[in-house]
């Protein structure tokens, strides 16, 4: 009679993470009598996966009923596969012995490859805000995928970016891999509503890539532009001076009025106007009693935005001239106060 052969018909098996792997194995003879064991790997460090004779293997089920006398099918199913299960599995026939069974013959092995989806990409930006025209770095990370081949792209508002570097680790063979990419983005004043998107494509995703996003509103600081203008007079001895604080982001802003370098009033922006591009506008006005000043007055609107050094704009108020000759040098608007300008 021909000697028993252990046949593992599948050289390799590819399974998606979370699914069940079927590892096929048949023997060509019932003799010699003895159990079957499954191992991952070969040599002294091999890992026992299933022992027909004894032990508890909750993830493993047999395809056939191994208790039947004439059974020669020793295929197994391993449930809830993870990338850690990847490796070469050997079906090994043992001969009954005393005191221990003796290894008789091994199958050629089946390599189990696990296809694992990448985790949702996580995009993170710089710790501190940056102003327009500056270049900032964004990182994108995704983990736990297999096989190693993966494609990563960066976009800003739908436009693909080219300035980025990507690494897939580890470089050698592994049960699963991670990707790390850093992209450089130049900020513009219009980026409050912008998004940076990291897109990851992998064989496990069936053409439906995963995306991670970062809102540039968390990264950008748009400094305000200031305009100080003198409005037409309300009364013979009063002049209304307006400070327009335009196109700033984020909202945190404090304004101080100075008269000849002395603090006149400090206020915090509360009722701001949101612009279409996501930036904010704010207006403050100062009513100056011209009769209280003997000399010309230098009025300064000083703004501290988002904890940055103060910026300021000044306006010279000529006290010597009759107040009514002090015209407005720009159009202004009714900002909700009960003050009215002259039509």
């Amino acid at each position: 009679e021909e000697e028993l052969q252990v046949i593992q018909p599948d050289k390799s098996v590819l399974v998606a993470a979370g699914e069940t792997a079927t590892l096929r194995c048949t023997a060509t003879s019932l003799i010699p009598v003895g159990p079957i064991q499954w191992f991952r790997g070969a040599g002294p460090g091999r890992e026992l996966i299933y022992n027909q004779k004894e032990g508890h293997f909750p993830r493993v089920t047999t395809v056939s009923d191994l208790t039947k006398r004439n059974n020669m099918d020793f295929s197994i199913r391993i449930g809830n596969i993870t990338p850690a299960d990847a490796g070469t599995y050997y079906c090994v026939k043992f001969r009954k012995g005393s005191p221990d069974d003796v290894e008789f013959k091994s199958g050629a092995g089946t390599e189990l490859s696990v296809r694992a989806k990448p985790s949702a990409p996580v995009v993170s930006g710089p710790a501190a805000r940056a102003t327009p025209q500056h270049t900032v770095s964004f990182t994108c990370e995704s983990h736990g995928f297999s096989p190693r081949d993966i494609t990563l792209k960066w976009f800003k508002n739908g436009n693909e970016l080219s300035d980025f570097q990507t690494n897939v680790d580890p470089v050698g063979e592994s049960v699963s891999y991670s990707i790390h990419s850093t992209a450089k983005v130049v900020l513009t004043r219009e980026d409050v509503h912008s998004q940076v998107i990291c897109e990851v494509a992998h064989v496990t995703l069936q053409g439906d890539p995963l995306r991670g996003t970062a809102n540039l509103s968390e990264t950008i600081r748009v400094p305000p532009t200031l305009e100080v203008t003198q409005q037409p007079v309300r009364a013979e001895n009063q002049v209304n001076v307006t400070c327009q604080v335009r196109k700033f982001y984020p909202q945190r802003l404090q304004l101080t009025w100075l008269e000849n370098g002395n603090v006149s009033r400090t206020e915090t922006a509360s009722t701001v106007t949101e612009n279409k591009d996501g930036t904010y506008n704010w207006m403050s006005w100062l009513l100056v009693n011209v009769s209280a000043h003997r000399d010309d007055v230098k009025l300064t609107c000083q703004v501290e935005h988002d904890g940055q050094p103060a910026v300021s704009k000044s306006h010279d108020l000529k006290v010597s001239a009759h107040p009514k000759e002090q015209g407005s040098n720009t159009a202004a608007e009714n900002t909700g106060s009960n003050e009215r300008n002259i039509y």
Epitope: R189, E190, T225, Q244, R246, K276, A331, E333
Partner: antibody
Framework: EVQVVESGGGLVKPGGSLKISCAAS????????MSWVRQTPEKRLEWVAY????????YYAETVKGRFTISRDNAKNTLYLQMSSLKSEDTAMYYC???????????WGAGTTVTVSS | DVLMTQTPLSLPVSLGDQASISCRSS???????????LEWYLQKPGQSPKLLIY???NRFSGVPDRFSGSGSGTDFTLKISRVEAEDLGVYFC?????????FGGGTKLEIK
């Protein structure tokens, strides 16, 4: 005094090109969004194109997309509109307008006339 | 595109009368930031248009309080409580909430 002054209009043949300009003065041009608005011979107003203060955002009316290009030179306080593949329907008075504090059109120029005719 | 429809095309009035101009948008013109960028402009003969009302109901600097704007969603109205000679001209509504921005066809306010 806050003002914008358009120039460069004229008579041009269909299919031809023309570049009109808008010189701004009396305000911090580089911090204002700007648009071009035109008025047809029938006196209808049409918004043509928009450019943000830094030039990073640009939008066009469908009727001019691909043919007109809005641009700005903040160092020269000047707004431009490059018009190509001109059609008779582009005949209009072209106004340069400033987007003010609440993003309305608060400053309008006197306009420059563009006539497209063979 | 958002179509802005103005009515009437022509509005003959007597000085001192109230005038009312309607503007209807083909879709909501509430911007994603919550503001409604509906404006009214007046163009007097031989002049460039001038801003009267912004964000539906706010009078621009120097505009007399006889001008008032109202409305929401898609229906907007400009009212002149007592028409004066200097109010004559063509009134345009305008939406600046969604690109492409669009003007209404205009309403000519003239003496009866």
């Amino acid at each position: 005094e806050v003002q914008v002054v358009e120039s460069g209009g004229g008579l041009v043949k269909p299919g031809g090109s023309l570049k009109i300009s808008c010189a701004a003065s009396g305000f911090a041009f580089s911090s204002y969004d700007m648009s071009w608005v035109r008025q047809t011979p029938e006196k209808r107003l049409e918004w043509v194109a928009y450019i943000s203060s830094g030039g990073g955002s640009i939008y066009y009316a469908e009727t001019v997309k691909g043919r007109f290009t809005i641009s700005r030179d903040n160092a020269k306080n000047t707004l431009y509109l490059q018009m190509s593949s001109l059609k008779s329907e582009d005949t209009a008075m072209y106004y340069c307008v400033r987007h003010g504090y609440h993003e309305y059109f608060d400053v309008w120029g006197a306009g420059t006339t563009v006539t497209v005719s063979s | 595109d958002v179509l802005m429809t103005q009515t009437p095309l022509s509005l003959p009035v007597s000085l001192g009368d109230q005038a009312s101009i309607s503007c209807r948008s083909s879709q909501s013109i509430v911007h994603s930031n919550g503001n409604t960028y509906l404006e009214w402009y007046l163009q007097k003969p031989g002049q460039s248009p001038k801003l009267l009302i912004y964000k539906v109901s706010n009078r621009f600097s120097g505009v007399p309080d006889r001008f008032s704007g109202s409305g929401s969603g898609t229906d907007f109205t400009l009212k002149i409580s007592r028409v004066e000679a200097e109010d004559l001209g063509v009134y345009f509504c305008f939406q600046g909430s969604h690109f492409p921005y669009t003007f209404g066809g205009g309403t000519k306010l003239e003496i009866k």
